[in-house]
C-alpha cells in the first residue's frame, strides 16, 4: 500500500461510538478504546478536550513503539499501562476539571475507529434541613453537580432558588411554608445522579425557632442517622464504566 493511500485511509472513519458517562468525583475512571487487537493497528490516539484548555493528545505509534503527548498537563490522566499492552486511558481521582470530551482514535490500514466519551463529573451535594420560622422549613442541597432536585412530603407553599458557583457546582435552596396545622412532620427529598437522600423535621410552633435536622436537637431526626440509610445509588453512581456496543 503506498503512502498516499495510507494517508487517505487515516481520515476514513469506519465506526464511531459516542457515550455520555457520568462519573463521581474522587473516584477513578477508565476509558476504553474500541475492541481492536493491537496487531491490526498503526496508531492509537487519545484526544482530550477539557473546558478552557487546548486539546491534549496522547498517541502511540506501533511501528516504532513510541508515545507522544501534545498539550497534556494533567498528570492524573495517563495510559492504564504501556499502550502496546493496554490502550485504555485512566483518570486517577476524578476532579471537576475533568469534565469534557475524551476520544480514542484507532488507526488501522483500512480506516479509523472512534470511541468518544462525554465525561460528566458528578459532585454529591451536602444536604441540610432546618426550620427558620414558624411552620417554615429550608432544605439545601449545597454544591452539587449537576443541580439536585428537591421535593417535599407533604407538598407545601414552596420557593426554590439556584446558586451557581464558578467551579460548576450548584446550590439548590427550597423554602417551604405549611399553613395547615395538622402537618407536624415534613420530609425533604433530594434527588441527584449520585443518589437520593431524605431528611425529616418536626415543625415546632416556636416563633423564630431555627432548628436543624442535622443538629440532633429536641424532636429533630435525621433519617440517615436514625435508620442508618445512606445515599441510594442513582443511575450515575457507578464507579465502573458500562460499555454500550
Amino acid at each position: 500500500m503506498d503512502e498516499k493511500q495510507i494517508t487517505q485511509n487515516y481520515s476514513k472513519v469506519l465506526a464511531e461510538v459516542n457515550t455520555s458517562w457520568p462519573v463521581k468525583m474522587a473516584t477513578n475512571a477508565v476509558l476504553c478504546c474500541p475492541p481492536i487487537a493491537l496487531r491490526n493497528l498503526i496508531i492509537i490516539t487519545w484526544e482530550i478536550i477539557l473546558r478552557g484548555q487546548p486539546s491534549c493528545t496522547k498517541a502511540y505509534k506501533k511501528e516504532t513503539n513510541e508515545t507522544k503527548e501534545t498539550n497534556c498537563t494533567d498528570e492524573r490522566i495517563t495510559w492504564v499501562s504501556r499502550p502496546d499492552q493496554n490502550s485504555d486511558l485512566q483518570i486517577r481521582t476524578v476532579a471537576i476539571t475533568h469534565d469534557g470530551y475524551y476520544r480514542c482514535i484507532m488507526v488501522t490500514p483500512d480506516g479509523n475507529f472512534h470511541r468518544g466519551y462525554h465525561l460528566q463529573v458528578l459532585v454529591t451535594p451536602e444536604v441540610t434541613l432546618f426550620q427558620n420560622r414558624n411552620r417554615t422549613a429550608v432544605c439545601k442541597a449545597v454544591a452539587g453537580k449537576p443541580a439536585a432536585h428537591i421535593s417535599w412530603i407533604p407538598e407545601g407553599d414552596c420557593a426554590t432558588k439556584q446558586e451557581y458557583w464558578s467551579n460548576g457546582t450548584v446550590t439548590v435552596k427550597s423554602t417551604c411554608h405549611w399553613e395547615v396545622h395538622n402537618v407536624s412532620t415534613v420530609t425533604c427529598h433530594v434527588s441527584h445522579l449520585t443518589g437520593n437522600k431524605s431528611l425529616y423535621i418536626e415543625l415546632l410552633p416556636v416563633p423564630g425557632a431555627k432548628k436543624s435536622a442535622k443538629g440532633g436537637g429536641s424532636g429533630l431526626n435525621d433519617i440517615f442517622e436514625a435508620q442508618k440509610i445512606e445515599w441510594h445509588e442513582g443511575s450515575g453512581g457507578h464507579h465502573h464504566h458500562h460499555h454500550h456496543h
Partner: antibody, heavy 119, light 110 residues
Framework: EVQLVQSGAEVKKPGASVKVSCKAS????????MFWVRQAPGQRLEWIGY????????KYNEKFKGRATLTSDKSASTAYMELSSLRSEDTAVYYC????????????WGQGTLVTVSS | DIQLTQSPSSLSASVGDRVTITCRAS??????????MHWYQQKPGKPPKLLIY???NLESGVPSRFSGSGSGTDFTLTISSLQPEDFATYYC????????FGGGTKVEIK
C-alpha cells in the same frame, strides 16, 4: 464481495512438505490480518498462526513453531501456509480466515483445503 | 493459553426446542469492558460461520433466534426456537491475543 479461495486438496507422504494458498479478493489485501486454522477429522479447530500482510508480521501457535511458515504475495493478494515434516496426525482441513478489526472476529473464511498425509 | 470447555459435547433436540450451549474459559476473556468471545456454526464440509461476536452481538444476516450472553469466564449461546437448518456443530472462540476454540457442541435431531 469479499472472497477467500484456497488451493485444492493434497496428498503427501510423511516427512514431506505442503504449501496451501489462499487468494483474497474484494478488499485491500494488505489491510487485514490473515489467520490459518486447521481441523483434523472429529477434532476441534486449531490455530496455526497469522500473518499481517501490511507489515509482514507473523505469529505462530507454539505447537507449530519451526514447522509452519506463513508468507504472503502482496502483488497477487495471496497468503500461503507451508507445513513441513508432515506426520499422519497433520491430516486435516486447513482454512484461511480474514480477521475483521472490530472484536477480532472471523466473518470471511476460505472453503478449506484437505491435506492427507499417508504412506 | 486460555482453554475453552464447551458443554454439552452433543445434544438431541426437536424443531421448535429452545437450545442452550455453554462455554467456560479457564480465565477471564473480558477486558476493557468487552468480552472477547464469539460463537460459530459449522456444517459438514463447510467452514465455520460467525453467529455472535463479543459475547452478545448478533452478526449481520444471522437470524434473531440466536443470542449470546455472559462475561468473564462463563458464556452461553441460545437458540430460542430450533429450526431444521440449525442442526450443526457450534463452537465458541476466543481471540484477543491467542486464538482458541472450544471443543464443539453437536446439535442432532431427536
Amino acid at each position: 464481495e469479499v472472497q477467500l479461495v484456497q488451493s485444492g486438496a493434497e496428498v503427501k507422504k510423511p516427512g514431506a512438505s505442503v504449501k496451501v494458498s489462499c487468494k483474497a479478493s474484494g478488499y485491500t489485501f494488505t489491510s487485514y490480518v490473515m489467520f490459518w486454522v486447521r481441523q483434523a477429522p472429529g477434532q476441534r479447530l486449531e490455530w496455526i498462526g497469522y500473518i499481517n500482510p501490511y507489515n509482514d508480521d507473523t505469529k505462530y501457535n507454539e505447537k507449530f513453531k519451526g514447522r509452519a511458515t506463513l508468507t504472503s504475495d502482496k502483488s497477487a493478494s495471496t497468503a500461503y501456509m507451508e507445513l513441513s515434516s508432515l506426520r499422519s496426525e497433520d491430516t486435516a482441513v486447513y482454512y484461511c480466515a480474514r480477521e475483521d478489526y472490530y472484536g477480532s472476529r472471523f466473518v470471511y473464511w476460505g472453503q478449506g483445503t484437505l491435506v492427507t498425509v499417508s504412506s | 493459553d486460555i482453554q475453552l470447555t464447551q458443554s454439552p459435547s452433543s445434544l438431541s433436540a426437536s424443531v421448535g426446542d429452545r437450545v442452550t450451549i455453554t462455554c467456560r474459559a479457564s480465565k477471564s476473556v473480558s477486558t476493557s469492558g468487552y468480552s472477547y468471545m464469539h460463537w460459530y456454526q459449522q456444517k459438514p464440509g463447510k467452514p465455520p460461520k460467525l453467529l455472535i461476536y463479543l459475547a452478545s452481538n448478533l452478526e449481520s444476516g444471522v437470524p434473531s433466534r440466536f443470542s449470546g450472553s455472559g462475561s468473564g469466564t462463563d458464556f452461553t449461546l441460545t437458540i430460542s426456537s430450533l429450526q431444521p437448518e440449525d442442526f450443526a456443530t457450534y463452537y465458541c472462540q476466543h481471540n484477543r491475543e491467542l486464538l482458541t476454540f472450544g471443543g464443539g457442541t453437536k446439535v442432532e435431531i431427536k
